[in-house]
């Protein structure tokens, strides 16, 4: 279980080359555990294998398999990451028919610098 | 009234060239991801190359890659193919169509590779 | 690469059959199938996207379904300008890559 709060290494295969290699989970989509994560993130891989935004693999892994560091924080994306990406790949989103989940929606997360995240307590929900 | 029409077929020699073109009309052609999708005489699909909404991004099969340039121009509603090096077995029907996905098709053009 | 294997490769059946032709991918593809429908001699035509959206025109004799790896097509009852190739194909990832295709003929 994740009572505890515990940050685990990345298995999903996608994210592992990114510059962080731990996770925690719930993610902000309540995805319970990386098999599942990988599940759900699938749906918008094309995005990335059509390469709509050069940030969009990133994106993708932040939100659905999201940092932790230092075992006490949980890094969500940034807002400005959010924006960047959803601006890239607004056309192929709707080409593609993807549902944006709202809790990506990116007026609800947080403004931070990608370098020093905003963190948030794994165990609240976090809106931004 | 959608269309999609391809120009530029015909016999070539093996190791030439051809550039192929598409004109298409009746939507908007840079909403669109387009693409080239070929049939040889008496067999299945399969797809050539791939270009995104404004040009900048190319996608290609491994048998034409290092070969064939995909390109467009939108203040003209023109998809391009170019191709070089070409061989017997680039002989086919070559289609242009919307590219995700494959809605709207051309009527083809053949592309024959012959000495 | 993303394989796709279409069976059967050819079937015969008369009118009003009902007709199912399958699709797998060599790994998940989501929901990312499409399925065409060609005529000797004609470009392709889109019926089914996203593996079971019924294209705008088409009747609803067509329909899809799965998700992941395997895939349907299902036609009701099979109507005289049914008698085509069907192929589908994904648009997971590149290569864009299409099944070897599935003839329905007259039986």
């Known amino acids: 279980g994740h009572s505890l709060f515990t940050c685990e290494p990345i298995t999903v295969p996608r994210c592992m080359k990114m510059a962080y290699n731990m996770t925690f989970f719930p993610n902000l989509m309540g995805h319970y555990d990386q098999s599942i994560a990988a599940v759900e993130m699938e749906h918008f891989l094309p995005l990335a294998n059509l390469e709509c935004s050069p940030n969009i693999e990133t994106f993708l892994c932040k939100a659905f398999v999201p940092t932790c560091i230092e075992q006490i924080h949980v890094v969500p994306p940034c807002r400005k990451l959010c924006e960047k990406v959803y601006s890239d790949c607004k056309k192929l989103i709707d080409t593609f028919g993807i549902r944006w989940p709202e809790e990506l929606e990116c007026d609800r997360l947080q403004y931070c610098d990608e370098t020093v995240p905003v963190t948030f307590d794994p165990h609240t929900e976090f809106l931004g | 009234e959608v269309q999609l029409v391809e120009s530029g077929g015909g016999l070539v020699q093996p190791g030439g060239s051809l550039r192929l073109s598409c004109a298409a009309s009746?939507?908007?052609?840079?909403?669109?991801?387009m693409s080239w999708v070929r049939q040889a005489p008496g067999k299945g699909l399969e797809w050539v190359a791939l270009?995104?909404?404004?040009?900048?991004?190319?996608f290609y099969g491994e048998s034409v890659k290092g070969r064939f340039t995909i390109s467009r121009d939108n203040s003209k509603n023109t998809l391009y193919l170019q191709m070089n090096s070409l061989r017997a077995e680039d002989t086919a029907v070559y289609y242009c169509?919307?590219?995700?996905?494959?809605?709207?098709w051309g009527q083809g053009t053949l592309v024959t590779v012959s000495s | 690469d993303i394989q796709m294997t279409q069976s059967p490769s050819s079937l015969s059946a008369s009118v009003g059959d009902r007709v199912t032709i399958t699709c797998r991918a060599s790994?998940?593809?989501?929901?990312?199938l499409n399925w065409y429908q060609q005529k000797p001699g004609k470009a392709p035509k889109l019926l089914i996207y996203?593996?079971?959206s019924l294209q705008s025109g088409v009747p609803s004799r067509f329909s899809g379904s799965g998700s992941g790896t395997d895939f349907t097509l299902t036609i009701s009852s099979l109507q005289p300008e049914d008698f085509a190739t069907y192929y589908c194909?994904?648009?997971?990832?590149?290569?864009?890559?299409f099944g070897g295709g599935t003839k329905v003929e007259i039986k």
């Open positions: 169509n919307t590219g995700i996905p494959m809605l709207y």
């Open positions: 996203a593996a079971s």
């Open positions: 270009v995104g909404y404004d040009g900048s991004q190319q």
């Open positions: 009746g939507f908007t052609f840079s909403d669109h991801y």
């Open positions: 194909q994904q648009s997971y990832s590149t290569p864009l890559t």
């Open positions: 790994q998940s593809i989501s929901s990312y």
